[in-house]
């Protein structure tokens, strides 16, 4: 096992909330029984971190949220991986067990002595984690122990289930809004063949069959829909372009609905396959505008179109987090770590130096340099803040007239605490209301990005519309520049004229042949052609009959 | 081995350049060139390193804006000195080390000496 | 910037005896110290990295200890060719920079 992920981020208080941030990449296919994860991560994981520990000081700073009381944390890390987010949860569930125990004084030294020691206070609810198939594993644990999840980027329609997920809540929306604006994309540029993609697990699932009913009722058909693993190798992203290349010149466009990394592991097959520009791609918001998919792969993501949650940057998380040094942030665990692979140095003589790395990391580095804030980041900290204020609105019912944690609040009742939740509403780190409709789900709009050429060699994501409560916005120029670049995705044009389609047994209904009708059949609908009566005949525009005119011979009349 | 050069007399104001010759072995990634001073009868002063891999350099603050370290070949580094005063004076050595300064310095050149006077 | 405090500045011990040399930093350096001896004439000549690493040639009479502020190199079983002045080298990693303390003349009799 991998020591890392054993690794806590601690911040005392009175009341202690629990995190899942991703702080490192899933483990790798051959590192799954292991589970030791990959590379630290910046935006999903170092940012998130810092994120929480900033935003509780804030918190915990403002008089009027949870006066004389401190919220503190305990941060583990979920890998963007199941079996390690449960694995973590359960410690969190550990500390709640034990501190019950010791509410019962329960607690007993081995030789039956009665214990001085004081174990970690319960996790009263947890923060995240991101990913959709991960937050229902840990959901599925903690609502065994009435403690309240709120997630902030985790998105799948099936967490909108409360029977199934009742101590679940999302500062974001439900996929199923965002599978809508995909298909209203594809309707508007008349791509009516399509391949699919999605990441195999609940996100890209669940998200995937919305697309794929919702295009039905538009008459958009699926070349072929595949599904993959996000940690697949090399040989199964070569595998799948090859299968999405036999679907071209006709199916060009490439509904995604993955997870970035799955994203990445295209582009790079991409490039392998020397595939450049042979698709475009429809990207769910796993991708968004985030670097990290694109970087290297820049010319294969070129046309890019993708589906980001509307969430601002957050100047003051930027205005704290670009201070940090690796010399004095020591709250965070893995912060030399991180700052050993942003910068690929070594951070020579500290205890955490990594000797894979030959070159010492000079003092005058920054985090200012190529800086990108993580799209989800307020979200993140709206998740903190919801917890902070359902335990301010349960504070203020249950103690009434005291500053403080009063002796009806202790410990603290997780249905209670779901309840004030549940009724939470505040303005929001970017001034919107945050609000948790009767599933525990927030209403959302989204961003249309569009990952285009700025210049040579410089690529970068332009949002070019907007998808707002089932308003399509789109710049059509700023997409495509003029009319005739729109991309066509089609697998047959139209019939012309006295042409009816002829459906291929066994292929879907976009795809025809176009036969021509007989000399006396006229076009009676888009499949079938039609006999005219005797003494009638196929009007000029085939599409119906006229009487043929009596001509009378007289015996004086040429020959015909 | 190391061998430095470029040592001698100079005026107050003045300016040197020194010169450390490596041989034996490449300044490939695996190596920081470091320049290190004694005044006489004095211990040893740290000045700066220069990682080989790609030209990183460090310094000590005291010495930054008027000494500049520089690898010129795949065998040499050079350390050009500015604005020299009486308290330069001292024997400059050229050091090899894994690191900047945690690994210790593990080859020495014999030094070169760096008068300043009038 | 760091400071290499070392001490004594001088010590006399006779054949086969021990000395003890002491290093005090101004901040903590973890691990980070070298030892050095150096003979009149001639470049420092490194004894140990990283506090107790022993460099490969030298004989294991010289022993390095200490981490944080403290460190101490020790000398078992002088032999003549031990009298030199010996230095340390600590280095910081919080302002990527090195200092030297002032030097222990070893006096051996």
């Known amino acids: 096992q991998s020591s890392e992920r054993r690794v806590v981020a601690h911040m005392p208080g009175d009341i202690i909330i629990g995190a899942l941030f991703s702080v490192h990449h899933q483990p790798t296919v051959d590192k799954v029984h292991e589970r030791k994860c990959g590379a630290v991560r910046e935006q999903y994981g170092i940012q998130r971190v810092e994120a929480m520990l900033h935003t509780l000081e804030r918190i915990n700073s403002d008089p009027t949220l949870l006066p004389n009381i401190t919220l503190g944390c305990e941060i583990r890390d979920s890998c963007w991986h199941s079996a390690v987010a449960l694995e973590q949860s359960i410690e969190f569930i550990r500390d709640s067990l034990i501190s019950s125990e010791e509410e019962e004084g329960l607690v007993r030294c081995v030789d039956g002595s009665s214990s001085s020691f004081r174990s970690k206070k319960p996790i009263v609810g947890v923060i995240g984690p991101g990913s959709s198939s991960v937050a229902i594993q840990v959901q599925n644990l903690l609502q065994l122990f009435n403690i309240p999840q709120i997630a902030y980027s985790a998105t799948s329609m099936d967490l909108s289930d409360k029977t199934l997920f009742k101590y679940f809540m999302r500062v974001v929306p439900s996929d199923a809004q965002q599978a809508r604006a995909m298909v209203d994309i594809v309707k508007r540029y008349n791509w009516t063949y399509v391949s699919a993609v999605h990441t195999e697990g609940n996100y890209g699932e669940s998200g995937m069959e919305a697309f794929k009913d919702m295009s039905a009722k538009e008459g958009i058909c699926i070349a072929h829909s595949y599904k993959i693993y996000s940690n697949a190798g090399e040989q199964s992203f070569d595998k799948l372009l090859k299968k999405l290349t036999s679907h071209l010149p006709k199916a060009r466009v490439v509904a995604c609905f993955c997870e970035g990394m799955t994203v990445r592991g295209l582009l790079m097959a991409m490039r392998r396959l020397g595939l450049a520009g042979e698709f475009l791609l429809l990207g769910s918001d796993g991708w968004a505008d985030r670097y990290d998919v694109t970087d290297g792969y820049q010319r294969e993501a070129v046309g890019g179109i993708t589906i980001k949650l509307q969430s601002p940057d957050v100047k003051w998380f930027d205005d704290y987090y670009l201070k940090l040094r690796p010399e004095t942030n020591h709250r965070n665990p893995w912060f030399q770590e991180f700052w050993q692979h942003r910068f690929q140095c070594r951070l020579e003589g500290f205890p955490q130096e990594n000797s894979k790395y030959n070159k010492t990391c000079n003092s005058s580095l920054t985090l200012k340099t190529h800086h990108v804030q993580d799209s989800k980041m307020g979200f993140v900290i709206n998740a903190i803040y919801s917890m902070a204020y359902g335990l301010h609105n349960m504070q203020m019912s249950l103690c009434p007239g005291y500053a403080g944690l009063c002796d009806a609040m202790k410990p603290i009742d997780g249905r209670k605490l779901l309840e004030s939740l549940m009724k939470t509403n505040f303005t929001g780190v970017s001034g919107d209301t945050i609000l948790f409709d009767e599933n525990g789900d927030s209403p959302g709009r989204y961003e249309i990005m569009n990952f285009k050429e700025m210049g040579k060699d410089y690529f970068d994501y332009i949002n070019v519309g907007s998808w707002d409560n089932g308003e399509l916005k789109m710049d059509d120029d700023e997409v495509w520049s003029k009319k005739s670049n729109i991309i066509r995705s089609v697998c047959s044009e139209p019939c012309e004229k006295g042409q009816i389609k002829v459906i291929r047994k066994g292929e879907v209904s976009c795809c025809w042949t176009c036969t021509p009708c007989k000399e006396n059949e006229y076009v009676f609908d888009e499949y079938t052609c039609k006999a005219c009566q005797l003494g009638s005949w196929p009007t000029d525009d085939l599409t119906g009959c006229d009487l043929i005119p009596v001509q009378y011979l007289r015996w004086g009349d040429p020959e015909p | 081995s190391v061998e430095e050069s470029g040592g001698g007399l100079v005026k107050p104001e003045g300016s040197l350049t020194l010169t450390c010759k490596a041989s034996?072995?490449?300044?490939?990634?695996?190596?920081?060139m470091c320049w290190v001073r004694q005044a006489p009868g004095k211990g040893p002063e740290w000045i700066a390193c220069?990682?080989?891999?790609?030209?990183?350099t460090y310094y000590a603050s005291w010495a930054k804006g008027r000494f500049t370290i520089s690898k010129t070949s795949s065998t040499t580094v050079t350390l050009q000195m500015t604005s020299l005063t009486a308290a330069d004076t001292a024997t400059y050595f050229c050091?090899?080390?894994?690191?900047?300064?945690?690994?210790?310095?593990?080859?020495w050149g014999p030094g070169t000496l760096v008068t300043v006077s009038s | 910037d760091i400071v290499m405090t070392q001490t004594p500045a001088s010590v006399e011990a006779a054949v086969g005896g021990t000395v003890t040399i002491k290093c005090q930093a101004s901040?903590?350096?973890?691990?980070?110290l070298a030892w050095y001896q150096q003979k009149p004439g001639q470049p420092p000549k490194l004894l140990i990295y990283?506090?107790?690493n022993l460099e490969s040639g030298v004989p294991s009479r010289f022993k390095g200890s200490g981490s944080g502020t403290e460190f101490t190199l020790t000398i078992s079983d002088l032999e003549c060719d031990d009298a030199a002045t010996y230095y340390c080298?600590?280095?910081?990693?919080?302002?990527?920079?090195?200092?030297f303390g002032g030097g222990t003349e070893v006096v051996v009799k």
């Open positions: 220069i990682y080989a891999g790609d030209g990183t």
């Open positions: 901040e903590n350096i973890y691990s980070n």
């Open positions: 034996g072995f490449d300044l490939s990634s695996y190596y920081y």
């Open positions: 050091a090899r080390g894994t690191g900047v300064g945690s690994y210790g310095y593990n080859l």
């Open positions: 990283r506090a107790s």
């Open positions: 080298q600590g280095y910081y990693p919080s302002a990527v920079t090195n200092a």
